[in-house]
Interface confidence: low
């Protein structure tokens, strides 16, 4: 703020992202025929009026008038952080300080610890790490659109003594719905200005099969051809399908992949049919009641999980 001393220069603190450009602006109301000067934290003069004093091509003159001296520093490095001084050589010399804070941009996070082919109900533990942030960034986890609660972000100083490496772990019990899900670790930091910087890990979950019997056509009549499709789901996908008819000698022959075919439907085909879908994760038997006397088959609500 402008003080009562019209010859007192003023400036402002600035925050810049590493690699970015910062503009340092110094103003004075009454210059008393003196020039303004900018110097760096090492007390090296950068500009005296419109005259360049330091050979650094990153530092450029923006504006030089009797009442203002503005310079820009491009490709700012962490080492550029500190107090910059604007001076006016009146009697006495008056100065104003600008604290330049350089933000370290966090690197893209790295996810480690994923063990392939997790089984349903097992616990997945993933670790996430990001280096280079200043101040220390925060890490968050999500699974799809759902937030995951990881442990508190751990902070470790990088070897340069200026930036930080942050890390976080998350553990959760996987379900079959998680098969193919993306676990995302995002880094949150003011240098990113809301931009997303994240890494995702797609997980595979092995789970026991399920099956469903689907008739084709949906409403077969006596004399028609009928296909009973056994549609297996699971990871891995069931590779073996066995058909049985209650009261008959098992198993029945399949004639088309996992389907049971009736070339010419008759009343003796009535009964309850079971299809057992098997993978190396287990088996599941679905049942279907076929009543040829009726105009359409009635699916049974019962199914058995082995």
């Amino acid at each position: 703020n402008l003080s009562q001393d019209d010859s007192q220069p003023w400036t402002s603190d600035e925050t810049v992202v590493a690699g970015g450009t910062v503009v340092l602006k110094c103003q004075v109301k009454d210059h008393e025929d003196s020039s303004l000067q900018w110097s760096n934290p090492a007390q090296q003069t950068l500009y005296f009026g419109e005259k360049r004093a330091l050979r650094d091509n990153r530092i450029q003159l923006v504006s030089s008038t009797p009442h203002e001296l503005s310079i820009s520093i491009s490709n700012v490095a962490l080492a550029d952080e500190g107090e910059y001084t604007c001076s006016i050589f009146t009697m006495p010399v008056r100065t104003a300080k600008s604290l330049v804070t350089v933000l370290g941009i966090p690197q893209k996070p790295i996810i480690t610890g994923y063990k392939s082919s997790l089984r349903e109900k097992e616990t997945a533990t993933l670790n996430c790490q990001s280096s280079g942030s200043k101040p220390a960034a925060q890490l968050t986890w999500r699974k799809g659109d759902q937030e995951l609660h990881g442990d508190q972000t751990r902070i470790q100083e990088d070897p340069n003594g200026k930036t930080f490496t942050v890390s976080s772990s998350v553990s959760f019990q996987v379900t079959r719905e998680d098969d193919g899900a993306n676990i995302v670790c995002s880094v949150n930091h003011e240098s990113l200005k809301g931009a997303d910087r994240s890494t995702s890990q797609r997980i595979e979950v092995l789970y026991t099969p399920t099956a469903m019997i689907r008739p084709e056509p949906a409403h077969p009549r006596e004399g028609q051809k009928l296909l009973l499709h056994c549609e297996g789901r699971g990871n891995p996908v069931p590779q073996q399908y066995v058909w049985v008819k209650e009261g008959s000698e098992p198993p029945l022959k399949m004639t088309q992949e996992s389907a049971l075919i009736f070339p010419f439907l008759n009343k003796s085909d009535s009964g309850t049919y079971g299809c057992t879908a098997t993978s190396n994760m287990g088996s599941y038997t679905a049942y279907f009641t076929l009543n040829v006397n009726d105009p359409s088959p009635v699916p049974s609500s019962s199914s058995t999980y082995h």
């Epitope: 089984r119 349903e120 109900k121 026991t208 098997t278 190396n280 994760m281 287990g282 082995h306």
Partner: nanobody, 124 residues
Framework: QVQLVESGGGLVQPGGSLRLSCAAS????????RGWFRQAPGKEREFVAA????????NYADSAKGRFTISRDNAKNTVYLQMNSLKPGDTAVYYC?????????????????WGQGTQVTVSS
Amino acid sequence: QVQLVESGGGLVQPGGSLRLSCAASGRTFSNYARGWFRQAPGKEREFVAAIDYSGGSTNYADSAKGRFTISRDNAKNTVYLQMNSLKPGDTAVYYCAAPASRRPSWDADGYDYWGQGTQVTVSS
């Protein structure tokens, strides 16, 4: 050293029941599947039942369905085979087996560690 120790076998009358136990030592088996197999004199070893690491998935041979139940107690590192309505055809040496991976398997090739077996005799 991995060890699987079966117990609970014996002589039982037809229609009777037995409960076999398989205790594991030398390694934590709670995260792994376990299986029961049997071998009758002069016959090949055959699959009886298997259970996954959590107990959520089980599988049975046709000869065991409805009569035998496999279960596990991970706190005790033990798997059980409850055998009801026993028949003379169930007479065999019963073996407990564990795979070296978490993947369950329903045939003998999928198992790496075997117990010494326990004799089950069903006779009147």
